[in-house]
Interface confidence: medium
């Protein structure tokens, strides 16, 4: 790669902070531990130093250079999740009422249906940022060493975590904007008038439902805090910002706050659900509501994270990452061949 000419001193490479954003738990400190750090993320940074002649790029190079290579996988995954969730929500919210009682709910598609897709995609992508770390830790525990290569797919996944995280933030922001638009909709205004009329009809002076009020206050509040933390993570992933942080600061923000945002997002979804878990009406055509599917992966990730945080396992993982090897699990010949 042409960028290599910009740094001649190999020592400089060691001083650079590799950016593996939105979660950094030293999972790449394995086999190629440090060397893999040189090979991959550093080159991303070196790219930035190599654009002096970017406007004079030869035409043949323009065709061979891939467009946003690291975004391919996250965008594909996001598109698949979004499409499936859209079809699933469409089936439950629009097609079911049409098929069973001739209700035409097509007006729900532009905002209400889309706003069920957005949080689903956002929380799933955020879970996918932290899932490879969990898998990597399990793999390392299983192998008993860090000197064994991860499978290619896991390697690829680990290197696209930043993109997964930024896409998650993007969908979360869209979700917030769509949610804020609810009271502006004509359909909502007409419904509000209907509700007011029904209140008069029923001689109800007070429509207050305490638990429903608490439910919304809590889940909106958690959603705001979760989004704010995601915003902080997104900002710290900007190269100019991340360069101003020490490795420890950067690592702390990306790993600790990241999991906090996933936790808040999950609680936000669970409180939104409230007592709908036991409401049989939610199971349209025997299908669970979207929120039930949405929280599944985040809960799995959080459970595994909690398990891996147990002192006995945590100590072992840290030992492995510092070079310790579990001799009972290592094939001696394998190490010899590697050496």
């Amino acid at each position: 790669m042409e960028s290599r000419k910009d740094i001649t001193n190999q020592e400089e490479l060691w001083k650079m902070k590799p950016r593996r954003n939105l979660e950094e738990d030293d999972y790449l400190h394995k086999d190629t531990g440090e060397t893999s750090m040189l090979k991959r993320p550093v080159l991303l940074h070196l790219h930035q130093t190599a654009h002096a002649d970017e406007f004079d790029c030869p035409s043949e190079l323009q065709h061979t250079q891939e467009l946003f290579p690291q975004w391919h996988l996250p965008i594909k995954i996001a598109a698949i999740i979004a499409s499936l969730t859209f079809l699933y929500t469409l089936l439950r919210e629009v097609i079911h009422p049409l098929a069973t009682s001739h209700q035409q709910y097509f007006y729900k598609i532009p905002i209400l249906v889309i706003n069920k897709v957005l949080p689903m995609v956002s929380i799933t992508l955020l879970a996918l940022v932290y899932l490879p770390g969990v898998i990597a830790a399990i793999v390392q525990l299983h192998n008993g060493t860090k000197y064994k290569k991860f499978p290619h797919w896991l390697d690829k996944w680990m290197l696209t975590r930043k993109q997964f995280g930024l896409l998650s933030f993007f969908f979360a922001v869209l979700h917030a904007i769509y949610s804020l638009s609810y009271p502006m909709r004509r359909s909502y205004r007409y419904k509000l008038l209907n509700w007011a009329y029904q209140q008069v009809q029923q001689n109800k002076e007070d429509a207050w439902i305490e638990h429903d009020v608490w439910r919304m206050e809590i889940y909106v509040s958690l959603g705001i805090v979760g989004l704010a933390i995601l915003a902080l993570l997104a900002v710290t992933s900007i190269p100019s910002v991340s360069d101003s942080l020490t490795w420890r600061e950067f690592h702390y923000i990306q790993s600790k706050l990241g999991i906090v945002s996933l936790l808040l997002g999950t609680i936000h979804a669970l409180i939104f659900a409230w007592n709908k878990w036991i409401d049989i009406k939610q199971f349209v055509w025997y299908t669970p509501p979207t929120f039930m599917i949405a929280v599944f992966l985040p809960i799995v990730v959080l459970i595994f994270k909690s398990i891996l945080f147990l002192p006995c396992l945590r100590k072992k993982i840290l030992k492995i990452r510092h070079g310790w090897e579990d001799v009972t699990k290592i094939n001696k010949t394998e190490i010899c061949s590697q050496l």
């Epitope: 009422p97 069973t100 009682s101 001739h102 209700q103 035409q104 709910y105 359909s187 007409y190 419904k191 209907n194 509700w195 029904q198 009809q201 029923q202 001689n203 109800k204 002076e205 007070d206």
Partner: antibody
Framework: QVQVQESGPGLVKPSQTLSLTCTVS?????????WNWIRQPPGKKLEWIGY???????VYNPSLKSRVTISRDTSKNQFSLKLSSVTAADTAVYYC?????????????????WGQGTLVTVSS | DIVMTQSPDSLAVSLGERATINCKSS????????????LAWYQQKPGQPPKLLIY???TRESGVPDRFSGSGSGTDFTLTISSLQAEDVAVYYC?????????FGGGTKVEIK
């Protein structure tokens, strides 16, 4: 399993007040459901009298409004109907029935569970 | 008040045949905001309270045989018994719950021919 049972005198003299009680067992009258009174004169159609909501709010049929009072006793899980100044035209089988509470999406629900009914005759 | 008009007043149908009862309301029972028709159908056998068969004009109450079906929208509704059984002999009422006061149709007596 929810049980709804109407009770009260089977015979009421004209101009007096008819009092009926509906006892609900297996379900709290203050949650999830509103409670209605309906009557059916012999061989005639059903007539809705009124209802009491989970919050205690009441709605009455305008044709009977001046004579009707529906109240409840949450400690006994009962609600009652009082119909004043009765005439022979008030002779009917009186039913109490439940309907799911109003909600912001579907507004109202049909009456899904009815008591067996009690015949009240207005005669001197 | 919303006036509910049922037709016919009585209906004699052979066992296994189709029975159709009509119900007309004096104003629409369709809420456009949620696309629901606020109409219910009840079955009342002699000496018994009414039993809910259909609500939202189309939806069968749990436990109700699928030979009972509801149709219609706005002001015109129909209850259909696709294959009349001996136990279906009863008086059938339609009821609106769109507006207070709740009102019932005059009833249709279904008998076996």
């Amino acid at each position: 399993q929810v049980q709804v049972q109407e009770s009260g005198p089977g015979l009421v003299k004209p101009s007096q007040t008819l009092s009926l009680t509906c006892t609900v067992s297996g379900y709290s009258i203050t949650s999830d459901y509103s409670w209605n009174w309906i009557r059916q004169p012999p061989g005639k159609k059903l007539e809705w009298i009124g209802y009491i909501g989970e919050s205690g709010s009441t709605v009455y049929n305008p044709s009977l409004k001046s004579r009707v009072t529906i109240s409840r006793d949450t400690s006994k899980n009962q609600f009652s109907l009082k119909l004043s100044s009765v005439t022979a035209a008030d002779t009917a089988v009186y039913y109490c029935a439940r309907e799911r509470n109003y909600d912001y999406e579907l507004y109202y629900y049909a009456m899904d569970y009815w008591g067996q009914g009690t015949l009240v005759t207005v005669s001197s | 008040d919303i006036v509910m008009t049922q037709s016919p007043d009585s209906l004699a149908v052979s066992l296994g045949e189709r029975a159709t009862i009509n119900c007309k309301s004096s104003q629409t029972l369709l809420y456009r905001s949620n696309q629901k028709n606020y109409l219910a159908w009840y079955q009342q056998k002699p000496g018994q309270p009414p039993k809910l068969l259909i609500y939202w004009a189309y939806t069968r109450e749990s436990g109700v045989p699928d030979r009972f079906s509801g149709s219609g929208s706005g002001t015109d509704f129909t209850l259909t018994i696709s294959s009349l059984q001996a136990e279906d002999v009863a008086v059938y009422y339609c009821q609106q719950y769109y507006k207070y006061p709740r009102t019932f149709g005059g009833g249709t007596k279904v008998e076996i021919k």
